[in-house]
Amino acid sequence: SITGISPITESLASLSTYNDQSITFALEDESYEIYVEDLKKDKKKDKVLLSYYESQHPSSESGDGVDGKMLMVTLSPTKDFWLQANNKEHSVELHKCEKPLPDQAFFVLHNRSFNCVSFECKTDPGVFIGVKDNHLALIKVDYSENLGSENILFKLSE
C-alpha cells in the first residue's frame, strides 16, 4: 500500500535516455504524444513533475521476513496529465486523470549505474518503461540477465 495520499517529495526534471536523447511531449489532435529524440542545441528540454511516494511492503509480502519500503513515482509533464502504463498494448501513454491516480500511473523507482534510474510498472512487476523505435514502450526484463540494459535506463536532470 502507498503510505498516505501525499507525495513525500516532488521535483521538476527533464528526462533523457542513457544515450542522451530527450523525452518530449507534444499536443496533437487534442491528445499528447511522447517522443524520444535528439534535441537541437538551443531547444529547451521538456520538464516533468516527478512526485515520489513511499510504498510500504509488509513482511508477509516481501518474502524476506522484513517490512520494506519502496519508492514509487508518478510523472506529469503537464497539468492533469500523467504517464500511464498500458499493459495490454505494452505502451506508455499520457492520460488526463483526477486524483487518486490509478495504479497504472505509479512506477517503482530503481537506481542504476551511471547515475541512471529505471521505472518499473507497479501493476506489472518485471516490466519497465523503455525505449523502442524512438518511442516509450513497456519492456519485460529478465531480472537475472538484463537489469543494466540500456533501453530501460533514464537520466533525470533538475
Partner: antibody, heavy 121, light 107 residues
Framework: QVQLQESGPGLVKPSETLSLTCTVS????????VHWIRQPPGKGLEWIGV???????SYNSALMSRVTISEDISKSQVSLKLSSVTAADTAVYYC???????????????WGQGTLVTVSS | DIQMTQSPSSLSASVGDRVTITCLAS??????LAWYQQKPGKSPKLLIY???RLADGVPSRFSGSGSGTDFTLTISSLQPEDFATYYC?????????FGQGTKVEIK
C-alpha cells in the same frame, strides 16, 4: 532482524590487496543495495561503492582503478577488494544497506559495526 | 563530484538548546539528502532521509528542511544523548558524498 557484519584481516601490508566480506541477514540482496563506506581514524566518511539490487555495481571514481565489489547471493555476502593499498587506506570499513528497495535515494538505513583495517608493514 | 559543505564544523551547546546544522551542496540535489548521527566507536545512524523524513525510531526533536542546494538539520531541544558528530550525505548522484561532519559538544 536486519544485520550486516564485516569481516576480514585487520592488518594488510602496503602494496597488497585488502579483502573484506559483508555477511547480511534479515533481508534479500535481490531487493536492497549494499554499500561500502570507509572512515580513516578521526576523519569523515567516504563512500567506496555499491552493489545494487539486480547486480549492477557503481564505484567512487577516486578509487575505481583499485576497487572491486562482488556478491555471493547463495551465502548472502558482498565482498570488497582494494588493491595496491597504502597507509592512506587505513580506516574503519563499513557495509550498509539501502533504506528503500531498489533505490539509494533514501540513504543507508542499516550499518554493520565496522572493521578497522590497518595498512602497515 | 558533488561537494557537500557542512557548517559549523563544531559547536558547543547545553542541554535544552536549539541546535541548527547546515549543509550546502555544490549543485542541486533535489531533496535527496540524508543526515546521520555518529557516536565515538559506533556506526553512523540514519536520522533523516529525503531531506525532511524522520527515520524509524528517531525522536521528533530532530527535523530536516531544505531542497536544491541548502539543507538544515535542527534539534529542537538538545538532550544528553544527542552529543555526537552529525553528517549530511547527498544521494542524488554517485559518488554519494558526505559532508565533513559537525561535532556537537557539551558547553
Amino acid at each position: 532482524q536486519v544485520q550486516l557484519q564485516e569481516s576480514g584481516p585487520g592488518l594488510v601490508k602496503p602494496s597488497e590487496t585488502l579483502s573484506l566480506t559483508c555477511t547480511v541477514s534479515g533481508f534479500s540482496l535481490s531487493k536492497y543495495g549494499v554499500h561500502w563506506i570507509r572512515q580513516p581514524p578521526g576523519k569523515g566518511l567516504e563512500w567506496i561503492g555499491v552493489l545494487r539490487a539486480g547486480g549492477t555495481i557503481s564505484y567512487n571514481s577516486a578509487l575505481m582503478s583499485r576497487v572491486t565489489i562482488s556478491e555471493d547471493i547463495s551465502k548472502s555476502q558482498v565482498s570488497l577488494k582494494l588493491s595496491s593499498v597504502t597507509a592512506a587506506d587505513t580506516a574503519v570499513y563499513y557495509c550498509a544497506r539501502d533504506h528503500y528497495y531498489y533505490s539509494s535515494f533514501g540513504g543507508f538505513a542499516s550499518w554493520g559495526q565496522g572493521t578497522l583495517v590497518t595498512v602497515s608493514s | 563530484d558533488i561537494q557537500m559543505t557542512q557548517s559549523p564544523s563544531s559547536l558547543s551547546a547545553s542541554v535544552g538548546d536549539r541546535v541548527t546544522i547546515t549543509c550546502l551542496a555544490s549543485q542541486t540535489i533535489a531533496t535527496w539528502l540524508a543526515w546521520y548521527q555518529q557516536k565515538p566507536g559506533k556506526s553512523p545512524k540514519l536520522l533523516i532521509y529525503a531531506a525532511t523524513r524522520l527515520a524509524d525510531g528517531v525522536p521528533s526533536r530532530f527535523s530536516g528542511s531544505g531542497s536544491g542546494t541548502d539543507f538544515t538539520l535542527t534539534i529542537s531541544s538538545l538532550q544528553p544523548e544527542d552529543f555526537a558528530t552529525y553528517y549530511c550525505q547527498q544521494l542524488y548522484n554517485t559518488p554519494y558524498t558526505f559532508g565533513q561532519g559537525t561535532k556537537v559538544e557539551i558547553k
